[in-house]
Amino acid sequence: GPVPPSTALRELIEELVNITQNQKAPLCNGSMVWSINLTAGGFCVALDSLTNVSGCSAIEKTQRMLSGFCPHKVSAGQFSSLHVRDTKIEVAQFVKDLLLHLKKLFREGQFN
């Protein structure tokens, strides 16, 4: 997909930090999502995994931001080939993994 501008990526990183900082209670009532290969995938794959979560206000803004980075409409299960061995993880862990991955990309200058 198209490379998002660094400012938009920074905003996404900040939102992911907002919903995870000092958070120990399960996000989205402990909902589970597909673990994905973040290196092989990208924003659309991350959105695909989170599309399965509904009725969770904590990640609605994240879902909207990810959809802005994805050039086409994503439907649940569209990127199942990039799921990690049919492994599911909690939303909170998924969000933290995504956050660390995006920060790594940002530090490496891939979005500047």
């Epitope: 990183i13 900040e14 930090v17 900082q21 000092n22 958070q23 120990k24 209670a25 530090r107």
Partner: antibody, heavy 126, light 109 residues
Amino acid sequence: EVQLVESGGGLVKPGGSLRLSCAASGFTFSNAWMSWVRQAPGKGLEWVGRIRSEIDGGTTNYAAPVKGRFTISRDDSKNTLYLQMNSLRTEDTAVYYCATDQVGAYYGDYYGMDVWGQGTTVTVSS
Amino acid sequence: SYELTQPPSVSVSPGQTARITCSGDALPEKYAYWYQQKSGQAPVLVIYEDSKRPSGIPERFSGSSSGTMATLTISGAQVEDEADYYCHSTDSSGNHGVFGGGTKLTVLG
């Protein structure tokens, strides 16, 4: 050696201003969320505020008693944290510590690591 | 504003178990951190994220959390553990930090 060294404390009249500095060394300061904590004479610790790392937004948050009067900033090129204190009151008299912010530890490279300065004394008196 | 409540003081004999509690409405969803402060010194982190112990902190220090209460436990308290202990956490937004009022631990020699 991992350390934080504060400076800039002193005696100031009510209504006056002061800027504290905190020089960091021995760790990747730019990745760290940083806090200011104060302790009035004979009293407990009081959280003053924090600043996130730039990559995490650089956002600042403040405790209610200092909001609008104190400003936290950072200069990652100098590995230095600042606390600008305006409209000082006698109740701001305290030892001021800078410290790595443990809430932000997960996001930086100092998970489980704890760094505090030795503190600098601010006295507000007429 | 959000508050964390600690007992002002706890006393134990050497070798006994000391428990210091910290209560706050956001603790079911927010981590607690514990600091030890000896007279005239800067605080030292002894427990982070409810129950994790930083390197260099003796194993006798442990932490737990249940509901609105976090607990610091010192198993087999020693004279050198005599200090003020502060719990630290954030409000429900995670944006604003807060310290408990502190607990003076006395280890009766």
